[in-house]
């Protein structure tokens, strides 16, 4: 559990409390809400971040059409149960004993049930489609410049291995970023695409999770890239199990106005 030793802070997660009482007398940073020690050299898992947030005193188209199995997060914020490694537990329940199964990014993938509901395994979200619309600009961005800038962002800011950024599509004013990461591809120490997408989502909303860093200042060849709305679609390795086709299928994951 490394952290900046000089003043004992967590560069990658401001939703922490840090003290010099970790193993070997090192700085140890605990996530708000759960109290779990986090590794400040990489991104904190989305489950721990959500828990901290809930506890805080708060035609030849190049664009991808999400498949019929794509999930969107219509349930909003909740206080999740995380496993000992900080990942989402497969079954989540609220205070009134209503339970549901989630995928690895914490999005509900079954109908809601009672305490008898079984969720045998945590199903991995292996494909994330981040759909952005940017504010009007004088002209369209150069696609290759935009592609390079977004890949750089995920590599440098979120420490996501470049191989997991599958594609960047652009049809003004819509930008789509495809993240792909199968269970077999994810090695120990690799940033999870779900965590990278969540940090990006919070950055886009102007709610950066990084300690002391300025907000996200996205520029393509010096031109500001200002996002006015975001949709995020999640595709799981095993399709979700709902009792009927959900009409909410294409609802927004989040609606941003800047």
């Amino acid at each position: 559990h490394t952290a900046a030793q000089d003043n004992c802070t967590c560069p990658t997660n401001k939703m922490t409390v840090c003290s010099p009482d970790g193993p070997g007398g090192r700085c140890q940073c605990r996530a708000l809400g759960s109290g779990m020690a986090v590794d400040c050299s990489t991104l904190t898992s989305k489950c721990l971040l959500l828990k901290a947030r809930m506890s805080a005193p708060k035609n030849a188209r190049t664009l991808v059409r999400p498949s019929e199995h794509a999930l969107v997060d219509n349930d909003g914020l909740y206080d999740p149960d995380c496993d000992p490694e900080g990942r989402f537990k497969a079954r989540q329940c609220n205070q009134t004993s209503v339970c549901w199964c989630v995928n690895s990014v914490g999005v509900r993938r079954t109908d809601k049930g009672d305490l008898s509901l079984r969720c045998d395994e945590l199903v991995r979200t292996h494909h994330i489609l981040i759909d952005l619309r940017h504010r009007p600009t004088a002209g369209a961005f150069n696609h290759s410049d935009l592609d390079a800038e977004l890949r750089r962002l995920f590599r440098e800011r979120y420490r996501l291995h470049p191989k997991f950024v599958a594609a960047v599509h652009y049809e003004q004013p819509t930008i789509q970023i495809e993240l792909r990461q199968n269970t077999s591809q994810k090695a120990a120490g690799d940033v999870d695409i779900g965590d990278a997408a969540y940090y990006f989502e919070r950055d886009i909303k102007g709610e950066s999770l990084f300690q002391g860093r300025g907000g996200l200042d996205l520029r393509v060849r010096g031109e500001p890239l200002q996002v006015e709305r975001t949709l995020i679609y999640y595709l799981d390795e095993i399709p979700p199990k709902f009792s009927m086709k959900r009409l909410t299928h294409h609802h927004h994951h989040h609606h941003h106005h800047h």
Partner: antibody
Framework: QVQLVQSGAEVKKPGASVKVSCKAS????????IHWVRQAPGQGLEWIGT????????VYNQKFRDRVTMTADRSISTAYIELSRLRSDDTAVYYC????????WGQGTTVTVSS | EIVLTQSPATLSLSPGERATLSCRAS??????IHWFQQKPGGAPRLLIK???ESISGIPSRFSGSGSGTDFTLTISSLEPEDFAVYYC?????????FGQGTKLEIK
């Protein structure tokens, strides 16, 4: 040397409140968690909660959440625990301890709840 | 919450013998376990932190081992002053909890 010195014994009636203090010295008070633990007569140790004095961020054991308040006064390096609506089964020795591994403990404060 | 189960509840040994105390966690807690000794009328005293890290001023006969869910406190050769109650405690996540204790008594 590091020391945690607690306030004296208290006798209270059921329904009353009690406030125990823990004065720290010999280290930087703001950079270490202060935990509160209690031990009923002849029983084991029970974690009540913790406070980080630097920003007063407090975490409570669910069992006590609606009755306990932890505070810290950085100017005098003192942490406090207040337990309200006392019951007879709150009779115990209350300890403060430092850091996640409780390396230094106060001497304990006996709280007796009796009508 | 994480439940810590200590065994045995009581251990009867003679001075000079080796004592092995066990603490089992209900889920994986890495090495976030700490061991304490408590004598009648006194506050607990930290013996071992993070499963195996020694503490300044604690005799070298006290050692700890384990990770994940199973942890052990070993006293290599018992001294008369070692007969007391021993507790394990975890700091993996909130709420922190203690084991129920092992009473080490003279045989």
């Amino acid at each position: 040397q590091v020391q945690l010195v607690q306030s004296g014994a208290e006798v209270k009636k059921p329904g009353a409140s009690v406030k125990v203090s823990c004065k720290a010295s010999g280290y930087s008070f703001t950079t270490h968690w202060i935990h509160w633990v209690r031990q009923a007569p002849g029983q084991g140790l029970e974690w009540i909660g913790t406070i980080f004095p630097s920003n007063a961020y407090a975490v409570y054991n669910q069992k006590f959440r609606d009755r306990v308040t932890m505070t810290a006064d950085r100017s005098i390096s003192t942490a406090y625990i207040e337990l309200s609506r006392l019951r007879s089964d709150d009779t115990a020795v209350y300890y403060c301890a430092r850091a996640s591994y409780f390396d230094y403990w106060g001497q304990g404060t006996t709280v007796t709840v009796s009508s | 919450e994480i439940v810590l189960t200590q065994s045995p509840a009581t251990l009867s040994l003679s001075p000079g013998e080796r004592a092995t105390l066990s603490c089992r966690a209900s889920q994986n807690i890495g090495t976030s376990i700490h061991w304490f000794q408590q004598k009648p009328g006194g506050a607990p005293r930290l013996l071992i932190k993070y499963a195996s890290e020694s503490i300044s001023g604690i005799p070298s006969r006290f050692s700890g081992s384990g990770s994940g869910t199973d942890f052990t406190l070993t006293i290599s050769s018992l001294e008369p002053e070692d007969f007391a109650v021993y507790y394990c405690q975890h700091s993996h996540s909130w709420p922190f909890t203690f084991g129920q204790g092992t009473k080490l008594e003279i045989k």
